[in-house]
C-alpha cells in the first residue's frame, strides 16, 4: 500500500484494528514506558470459576503465533508537512510476559525526542496495543524505514516496515567548486542533486545563460573547453517539485602575479642588505619564487644588474657580497606558474662603512731605556672611501718571558701615527701588531714586529717593518 499525503488525515479515522469495540476506552502510555503490560485484573473480567490461563514453558511452544497487524507500507509527503503512522498488535491472554513496543528507524532504535504514544485496549480475550508515531514538519532526514519491535514471551516480534518518503525540491550533494584555470585550457565542473522525487535533471548556467539546451540526469559533469576571461558558473536542478539553483562559482583565469606592494629595508651592514616584501596579487596561482634585482645606484657604474633568486616564502632575503658604503637600487618580482610579475618600483638602499681592508704600514718599534717605554711608529694605510673614515688604531702588544705571558692592547686617535707604551716586563720579548679602525669596524692587524727587552742594560733591537705595497690607490 502507498499513502499519498492527501490521505494522511484518514490514517487514524477508520475502525481500530482487530476486534475492539468503538466505545471501548483505551489507556495510554508514552513510548518511553517499557513496563510489562498491565496485570490481567486491570480492565479485564474473568468468571469467578475460571482461572486465568497459566502458561508453562512447555505450553508456550504450543501458543498461537503473534504478529503485528498489517499496516500502511509507504507514506509519501512533502517537506514541512506533518505525518502520523502506527503499529498495532493483538496479544491473547495466554501470553504473560510482554514488553512494551519500541520504534526503530533504519535499524536504529528511536529514543528520546520523538513523539510516540502507546495505547492499550484490553478485553476478555487479551489486549490490543497501538503504537502511534508522529513527526511534525518533516525534513529529508526523516526519510527512511520505520518499524516496531516488541518482546512477547522472550521472543522478539518485528513489524513490517513503514517507508516514509519526504519529497521536496532537489537537494545538492555536490555543487560546482571555484577553480583557477589556465587560459584556453579545458576543465570539468560537477553537479549532483537528489530528490525524492527522482529523477533530478541538471541545467548548467554560465554568466546567467544556460549552457545546455537539454537537461542532463544528475549527476552531471560539464566539460568547459577553455575560457579567456573570468566566468561564473552555476547549475539548476529540476524535479517534479520544482527547481533549486546551486551557488555561483567564479572560474578565474590564471595570470602573472602583480608586483609586490611593499618593500622594506630591514637592516644594512657593510656588505649586506636585508629586505622584505609584501607580495602583490598572486594571479590565482601560488607564487613559486621571487627575484631580487640589485644594481649600483651610482650613475658612473656600468649599470649591470645582480639577480638573487629565492623561494617565495618567507618574503625575506639578505642580499650579500655588496660593497661597503655604496648606494644600491633594488627591485623585487615574483613568479607563479604563468610567469614573472613586473618588477616593483626601484627603491634605494645603502650599505654602511666597511672596516679597513689594509693594515698600517712601515711599523717600527724602539726601546727608550731612559724612560722605560716602547716608541712605536707606522704610516697610515691606504684606506678606500668605502672603508669609511679613519677613527684610530688598535695596538696589540704581547709580552713573553719565562713563565710570564701578558697580552694588552691600546687604542689611539686617528691624528697620530706613533704611540708610546710602557715596558711591562724585562728580560722578555714584546710582539707588536697594529690595526686601523673606522666606523665600520677594525681592519686586519699588521704582521708582528718583535723586540727583545733586556734585563736593564743593553737592548737587542730587531728592527722590523711591513713593506709598503706597490699600489696604494684609494
Amino acid at each position: 500500500e502507498k499513502w499519498e499525503e492527501t490521505e494522511l488525515d484518514q490514517l487514524f479515522s477508520g475502525p481500530l484494528p482487530g476486534r475492539l469495540p468503538v466505545n471501548h476506552r483505551p489507556f495510554s502510555a508514552p513510548h518511553s514506558s517499557r513496563d510489562q503490560l498491565p496485570p490481567p485484573q486491570t480492565g479485564r473480567s474473568h468468571p469467578a470459576h475460571t482461572a486465568a490461563p497459566q502458561v508453562t514453558s512447555t505450553a508456550s511452544k504450543l501458543l498461537p503465533p503473534v504478529a503485528f497487524n498489517h499496516t500502511i507500507g509507504h507514506i509519501v509527503l512533502s517537506e514541512h508537512k506533518n505525518v502520523k503512522f502506527n503499529c498495532s498488535i493483538n496479544i491473547p491472554n495466554t501470553y504473560q510476559e510482554t514488553a512494551g513496543i519500541s520504534w526503530w528507524k533504519d535499524g536504529k532504535e528511536l529514543l528520546g525526542a520523538h513523539h510516540s504514544i502507546t495505547q492499550f485496549y484490553p478485553d476478555e480475550e487479551g489486549v490490543s496495543i497501538i503504537a502511534l508515531f508522529s513527526i511534525a514538519s518533516v525534513q529529508r532526514s526523516d526519510n527512511g524505514s520505520y518499524f516496531c519491535k516488541m518482546k512477547v514471551n522472550n521472543r522478539e516480534i518485528v513489524s513490517d516496515p513503514i517507508y516514509v518518503e519526504v519529497q521536496g525540491l532537489p537537494y545538492f550533494i555536490k555543487q560546482p567548486e571555484s577553480v583557477n584555470v589556465t587560459r584556453n585550457t579545458a576543465f570539468n565542473l560537477t553537479c549532483q542533486a537528489v530528490g525524492p522525487p527522482e529523477p533530478v535533471n541538471i541545467f548548467w548556467v554560465q554568466n546567467s545563460s544556460r549552457v545546455n539546451e537539454k537537461p542532463e540526469r544528475s549527476p552531471s559533469v560539464l566539460t568547459v573547453p577553455g575560457l579567456t576571461e573570468t566566468a561564473v558558473f552555476s547549475c539548476e536542478a529540476h524535479n517534479d517539485k520544482g527547481l533549486t539553483v546551486s551557488k555561483g562559482v567564479h572560474i578565474n583565469i590564471k595570470v602573472i602575479p602583480s608586483p609586490p606592494t611593499e618593500v622594506h629595508i630591514l637592516n644594512s651592514t657593510a656588505h649586506s642588505i636585508l629586505v622584505s616584501w609584501v607580495p602583490g596579487f598572486d594571479g590565482y596561482s601560488p607564487l613559486q619564487n621571487c627575484s631580487i634585482q640589485v644594481k649600483e645606484a651610482d650613475r658612473l657604474s656600468n649599470g649591470s644588474v645582480m639577480v638573487f633568486n629565492t623561494s617565495a616564502s618567507p618574503h625575506l632575503y639578505e642580499i650579500q657580497q655588496l660593497q661597503a658604503l655604496a648606494n644600491y637600487s633594488i627591485a623585487v618580482s615574483c613568479r607563479n606558474e604563468i610567469g614573472w610579475s613586473a618588477v616593483s618600483p626601484w627603491i634605494l638602499a645603502s650599505t654602511t662603512e666597511g672596516a679597513p681592508s689594509v693594515a698600517p704600514l712601515n711599523i717600527t718599534v724602539f726601546l727608550n731605556e731612559s724612560n722605560n717605554i716602547l716608541d712605536i711608529r707606522w704610516t697610515k694605510p691606504p684606506i678606500k672611501r668605502q672603508d669609511g673614515e679613519l677613527v684610530g688604531y688598535r695596538i696589540s702588544h704581547v709580552w713573553e718571558s719565562a713563565g710570564t705571558y701578558k697580552e694588552l692592547s691600546e687604542e689611539v686617535s686617528q691624528n697620530g701615527s706613533w704611540a708610546q707604551i710602557p715596558v711591562q716586563i724585562h728580560n722578555a720579548t714584546c710582539t707588536v701588531r697594529i690595526a686601523a679602525i673606522t666606523k665600520g669596524g677594525i681592519g686586519p692587524f699588521s704582521e708582528p714586529v718583535n723586540i727583545i727587552i733586556p734585563e736593564h742594560s743593553k737592548v737587542d733591537y730587531a728592527p722590523s717593518s711591513t713593506p709598503a705595497p706597490g699600489n696604494t690607490d684609494s
Epitope: P260, T261, H264, N267, S268, S329, P345, W346, I347
Partner: antibody
Framework: QSVEESGGRLVTPGTPLTLTCTVS????????MSWVRQAPGKGLEWIGI?????STYSASWAKGRFTISKTSTTMDLKITSPTTEDTATYFC??????????????????????WGQGTLVTVSS | AAVLTQTPSPVSAAVGGTVSISCQSS????????LSWYQQKPGQPPKLLIY???DLASGVPSRFEGSGSGTEFTLTISDLECDDAATYYC???????????FGGGTEVVVK
C-alpha cells in the same frame, strides 16, 4: 576593487570623531592605505599611512592630531580633538607601492592608485 | 618639509590644443622619479594619471605625458578634450621623510 569612506558628520570642536574606510576586492594585509583630506575649495593634504603590517606614519603637521588603525577589512582615522581647521572632505586611498625603512622608522609612498569618494567632516560650534 | 610648487594656475587652451603644467620640488624627489600626477574633477576624488614621473596609469590615454627628474617635472596634455577640464596635482615622496607632498594644484580650463 573599491574603497569607501564613512563617518563624516557635523561635530563640535574638541569632540573626537572616527572615520572608517571599508575596502573590497583586495586585502589590507597586502596593501598599505593612506588618508588624504581636502578643505573646501583648497588643495589635497596628505595625513598619514598604515602599512600592510600595521605600521603607521603621519605627516609632520598631523602627528598627535590623528590616529590611524585598521582591522582585516577596514581602516580608521580618528580625529582626536577636531578644530574648525579640520573641516574638509577626507579621502582614503590605496597605496600602490610603499617602501619602508625599518631601521630609520620612515617610509615613502610611491603612488595612490585607488581612491574613495570621500566623506565630509564639518567642525563647527 | 619639502614643497612642491605648481605653475601656472589656471591654464587654459582650446579643444585640440596642448597645455603643460610645471611641478618644481624644493629638494630631490626620492629616487629622482617617484613623482605622480593626479587629476581631480569637481565633486570627484582624485584619479592617478602618471607615476614614476612618466609612466601612465592603467586606462589613461597616451595624450597625457609626464617628464622630468630630480626636482623639475612637467605634465603635458595634448589633443585637449572637454573632459580634460580638471585640477591636476603633482605629488611625491622624499628620502629620510615619510611626508607625501602634494603640489598646490593647477586648474586646466578647456575652451
Amino acid at each position: 576593487q573599491s574603497v569607501e569612506e564613512s563617518g563624516g558628520r557635523l561635530v563640535t570642536p574638541g569632540t573626537p570623531l572616527t572615520l572608517t574606510c571599508t575596502v573590497s576586492g583586495f586585502s589590507l594585509s597586502s596593501n598599505a592605505m593612506s588618508w588624504v583630506r581636502q578643505a573646501p575649495g583648497k588643495g589635497l593634504e596628505w595625513i598619514g599611512i598604515i602599512s600592510s603590517s600595521g605600521s603607521t606614519y603621519s605627516a609632520s603637521w598631523a602627528k598627535g592630531r590623528f590616529t590611524i588603525s585598521k582591522t582585516s577589512t577596514t581602516m580608521d582615522l580618528k580625529i582626536t580633538s577636531p578644530t574648525t581647521e579640520d573641516t574638509a572632505t577626507y579621502f582614503c586611498a590605496r597605496v600602490g607601492f610603499f617602501v619602508g625603512y625599518g631601521a630609520y622608522d620612515y617610509g615613502i609612498i610611491h603612488r595612490l592608485d585607488l581612491w574613495g569618494q570621500g566623506t565630509l567632516v564639518t567642525v563647527s560650534s | 618639509a619639502a614643497v612642491l610648487t605648481q605653475t601656472p594656475s589656471p591654464v587654459s587652451a582650446a579643444v585640440g590644443g596642448t597645455v603643460s603644467i610645471s611641478c618644481q620640488s624644493s629638494k630631490s624627489i626620492y629616487n629622482n622619479n617617484w613623482l605622480s600626477w593626479y587629476q581631480q574633477k569637481p565633486g570627484q576624488p582624485p584619479k592617478l594619471l602618471i607615476y614614476d614621473a612618466s609612466d601612465l596609469a592603467s586606462g589613461v590615454p597616451s595624450r597625457f605625458e609626464g617628464s622630468g627628474s630630480g626636482t623639475e617635472f612637467t605634465l603635458t596634455i595634448s589633443d585637449l578634450e572637454c573632459d580634460d577640464a580638471a585640477t591636476y596635482y603633482c605629488a611625491g615622496g622624499y628620502s629620510g621623510d615619510s611626508d607625501y607632498a602634494f603640489g598646490g594644484g593647477t586648474e586646466v580650463v578647456v575652451k
